[in-house]
């Protein structure tokens, strides 16, 4: 039961995280105009990964896409790449994890296959989260560098007679969305990896041999220890040879209206 909960929660957390990464990537407010030195501006500038926008006090907003690819800073291109890689890995991870969920049955998929898929999706979520966090952090670092550079040459030219304040940019909402989303995806991935350990059938150092007595359906292991019957408690949560019996986890995993896929 704990394994199913961990896996399900990991999936949901990762889903929220990846949705957040997508939202952050699409958002226009990666950097917003710093109003500290000009709080009375009637024109507010903000920029995203794909376009820059200007919101006038009149309420009109004008956005212009970055229609050049080669003319863009390498750092911006790198951030775009990191975010897209994060989204792609996350999307694939989600797809894989859907089939890995214990509450979903596809044919006669073994627990070992589900465990492998859970681990794969978990790793994908971790890498996806790291990509998002890295992308956002690179952009934030770029902003900090530019902020202090523009502060150094805040008032330029005109011999100080005319004030020409250079527009400075600070952290936009998308950065915080990206950090939180990346963190959630990372946590979701870790949870999936933890769930994978509980899903994987425990390896034994000997081969199990099944002896069929005429009267009873009992499985024995070499050494005379009784492995399992169709009725006793299966404390190890392993699959038993009786096709009709289910593990503890399986018994609890009937789909209900509260299961989100």
């Amino acid at each position: 039961m704990a394994v199913t909960a961990c896996q399900g929660l990991g999936f949901v957390v990762s889903l929220i995280g990846i949705a957040g990464i997508i939202a952050a990537t699409c958002m226009d407010q990666w950097s917003t105009q710093d109003l500290y030195n000009n709080p009375v501006t009637a024109v507010f500038n903000y920029q995203g990964l794909w376009r820059s926008c200007v919101r006038e006090s009149s309420g009109f907003t004008e956005c212009r896409g970055y229609f050049t690819l080669l003319g863009l800073p390498a750092m911006l291109q790198a951030v775009r790449a990191l975010m897209i890689v994060g989204i792609v890995l996350g999307a694939i991870g989600l797809l894989v994890s859907i089939f890995a969920l214990k509450c979903i049955r596809i044919g006669s998929m073994e627990d070992s296959a589900k465990a492998n898929m859970t681990l794969t999706s978990g790793i994908m979520f971790i890498v996806s989260g790291l990509c998002a966090i890295a992308g956002v952090s690179v952009f934030a670092n770029m902003l900090v560098t530019n902020f202090w550079m523009s502060t150094a040459n805040m008032y330029t030219g005109m011999g100080g007679m005319v004030q020409t304040v250079q527009t400075r940019y600070t952290f936009g909402a998308a950065l915080f969305v990206g950090w939180v989303a990346g963190g959630l995806t990372l946590i979701g991935g870790v949870m999936m990896c933890i769930a994978c350990r509980g899903l994987a059938p425990e390896e034994t150092n000997y081969k199990a041999v099944s002896y069929h007595a005429s009267g009873h359906s009992v499985a024995y292991k070499p050494g005379g220890f009784k492995a399992s019957t169709g009725f006793g408690s299966n404390t190890k949560n392993k699959k038993i040879y009786d096709g009709g019996a289910r593990t503890e986890d399986e018994v609890q995993s009937y789909p209900s209206k509260h299961d989100y896929v």
Epitope: N38, A42, V43, N45, S57, S58, T164, T167
Partner: antibody, heavy 118, light 113 residues
Framework: EFQLQQSGPELEKPGASVRISCKTS????????MNWVKQSNGESLEWIGN????????RYNQKFKGKATLTVDKSSSTAYMQLKSLTSEDSAVYYC???????????WGQGTTLTVSS | DIVMTQSPSSLTVTAGEKVTMSCKSS????????????LTWYQQKPGQPPKLLIY???TRESGVPDRFTGSGSGTDFILTISSVQAEDLAVYYC?????????FGAGTKLELK
Amino acid sequence: EFQLQQSGPELEKPGASVRISCKTSGYSFTGYNMNWVKQSNGESLEWIGNIDPYYGGTRYNQKFKGKATLTVDKSSSTAYMQLKSLTSEDSAVYYCARSYYGNAFDYWGQGTTLTVSS
Amino acid sequence: DIVMTQSPSSLTVTAGEKVTMSCKSSQNLLNNGNQKNYLTWYQQKPGQPPKLLIYWASTRESGVPDRFTGSGSGTDFILTISSVQAEDLAVYYCQNDYSFPFTFGAGTKLELK
């Protein structure tokens, strides 16, 4: 056709208050900010402040803070400006004007003449 | 507050003549974000409210004759009337639309010789 119809001329005594209205028609009232401008006896123009009819947010010229209060009535698509503690300095023509691209004012009311005299 | 200085204060011209009037701001009106200058020109005839001519320093408002041209950037702006007509006699105001409070120049009065 877009129209900004202002209330008629006002004659007030010093110390009194007055409320000037600006009724709009022909466009979405809540979609555009409304500005108020003062023009003293044919001289230059002074921006008093503006109001966002959708949210009700206001912004004032520091010079007119405490003197002017801007409000709107969305149901009648009307903007109001109340001027209090009137003095002879407040005698002027007051215009309402709609915000447009570039924060410019594209449509103006015909003006309301306020005369403050004892 | 941004101070807008217009010159000359009045201009006497003959019909058909080319006219230029200047507007200087105490601060830069160019917005880096969209490379637009937040300066507006208005025309006001006696007994009438001002009429929008040009916004963003050079964008002509629809319905405004193409003899009116706005130019300039940063702090120095010019309104040019290529061939003055009798109906152009009015006071012309420039306005800062870049930062609050929005401020107007004292105006340039265009008179006929």
